[in-house]
């Protein structure tokens, strides 16, 4: 029995409703009592969603998962996956069998985007050029884990004296410190730039030194 | 409303080919297994050949296997019965037939194709 | 020779209780399911009884169907002259990979 997956990972919004697809071809002879359908956590083998003897056996997963009862017997055997969380993130194994036996897995990417990054000087008065200054860009509240990229004001990449750190909350969502040490010139913009990789979202922030006064755009 | 409408029935020569074709309206085609099933005069129906909603499974009876073929074009919504090295027996109104996988029935039938076989 | 046995014919009057057995094995009726279905003279075979008991919509509650190992049978109550007609159980066959037919039986109301 051929179990159709898409190839490419599932990627879902925290918070947000996602649907794993799985379908079969619908046989001759087939009906819905024949039906066995067993969704899992493809690692752990922990199931996930259960349909046999003609009927939905539920969720076995936190209450948050549902079949498409209207659409089975015509060979849809997609889950839905309600209010995702971090946690979710993996691989499920669609089982199906009527009278013969096929399987396939399909992935799920979790994501959740980034907020705008907030800019913060130290020290953030009586600046001079030749001054070394600490520009620090915090991002919070994304998945997976951010690319963080500095750049000044003609748009060179700022590659040196560069230090990230990533923490996950409660959640398993990213807080994003990202510290540039620069020395500063007569005057100068500079650029963060917070991408996360899976929704290839971009959140920008930025400071302008100008001698004095300096402005946080 | 679901309606399938064959066509392609008529008189052949023993040894003869034919091509049935059913054409389905009013349902997601793909979703759904389909059959030939025959009737000859004054008997009882006889299940001849189905095919899976894919295309890539098909079955066929013992009667039938290497001269007939069963067929589907999901694009066009239609299905197919190729018939060759016909024989007299083979004569029949032939019915295509969808199943319903909630019920495991078929529970739309065409009008009947009628195929003579006579030289 | 059909896979599937039927009574050649049945037979009633107006208001009688008439049953139609259909005998068969375990590789079709033991382990799958039975339908049932209706040809009254002329027209395309209907649809009558699907999952071994149930009815479609539209089939009136007179029609019953049962399955008791590897045999099935349908009742007809209060019978009624529309109802004169050939009616043929079918199962799917696991061995054979087939659906397969009973021979049909002819109700005839009296």
């Known amino acids: 029995l051929e179990v159709q997956v898409p190839e490419d990972p599932v990627v879902a919004l925290v918070g947000t409703d996602a649907t794993l697809c799985c379908s079969f071809s619908p046989e001759p002879g087939f009906s819905l009592a024949q039906l066995n359908l067993i969704w899992q956590l493809t690692d752990t083998k922990q199931l996930v969603h259960s349909f046999a003897e003609g009927q939905d056996q539920g969720s076995a997963y936190a209450n948050r998962t549902a079949l498409f009862p209207d659409l089975l017997a015509q060979g849809n055997a997609s889950l839905r996956l309600q209010r995702v969380r971090v946690a979710d993130e993996g691989s499920f194994t669609c089982f199906v069998s009527i009278r013969d036996f096929g399987s396939a897995a399909v992935s799920l990417q979790v994501a959740a985007p980034y907020s705008k990054p907030s800019m913060t000087l130290e020290p953030n008065k009586d600046l001079r050029p030749g001054d070394t200054v600490t520009i620090t860009c915090s991002s919070y509240r994304g998945y997976p884990e951010a690319e963080v990229f500095w750049q000044d004001g003609q748009g060179v990449p700022l590659t040196g004296n560069v230090t990230t750190s990533q923490m996950a909350n409660e959640q398993g969502l990213f807080d994003v410190h990202s510290v540039l040490r620069v020395v500063l010139g007569a005057n100068g913009t500079y650029s963060c730039l917070v991408r996360n990789p899976v929704l290839q979202q971009d959140a920008h922030g930025s400071v302008t030194i100008t001698g004095q006064p300096m402005t946080f755009p | 409303e679901v309606q399938l409408l064959e066509s392609g029935g008529g008189l052949v020569q023993p040894g003869g080919s034919l091509r049935l074709s059913c054409a389905a309206s009013?349902?997601?085609?793909?979703?759904?297994?389909m059959n030939w099933v025959r009737q000859a005069p004054g008997k009882g129906l006889e299940w001849v050949a189905g095919?899976?909603?894919?295309?890539?499974?098909?079955y066929h009876t013992d009667s039938v296997k290497g001269r007939f073929t069963i067929s589907r074009d999901n694009s066009k919504n239609t299905l197919y019965l190729q018939m060759n090295s016909l024989r007299a027996e083979d004569a029949a109104v032939y019915y295509c037939?969808?199943?319903?996988?909630?019920?495991?029935?078929?529970?739309?039938w065409g009008q009947g194709t009628t195929v003579t076989v006579s030289s | 020779q059909s896979v599937l046995t039927q009574p050649p014919s049945a037979s009633g009057t107006p208001g009688q209780r008439v049953t139609i057995s259909c005998s068969g094995s375990t590789s079709n009726i033991g382990y799958n399911l039975v339908n049932w279905y209706q040809q009254l003279p002329g027209t395309a075979p209907k649809l009558l009884i699907y999952t071994n008991a149930q009815r479609p919509s539209g089939v009136p509650d007179r029609f019953s169907g049962s399955k008791s190992g590897t045999s099935a049978s349908l009742a007809i109550s209060g019978l009624q002259s529309e109802d004169e007609a050939d009616y043929y159980c079918?199962?799917?066959?696991?061995?054979?990979?087939?659906?397969?037919f009973g021979g049909g039986t002819k109700l005839t109301v009296l």
């Open positions: 079918a199962a799917w066959d696991g061995n054979l990979n087939s659906w397969v």
């Open positions: 009013g349902l997601t085609f793909s979703s759904y297994a």
């Open positions: 037939a969808k199943e319903d996988h909630w019920s495991g029935g078929m529970d739309v």
């Open positions: 095919i899976g909603g894919s295309g890539s499974s098909t």
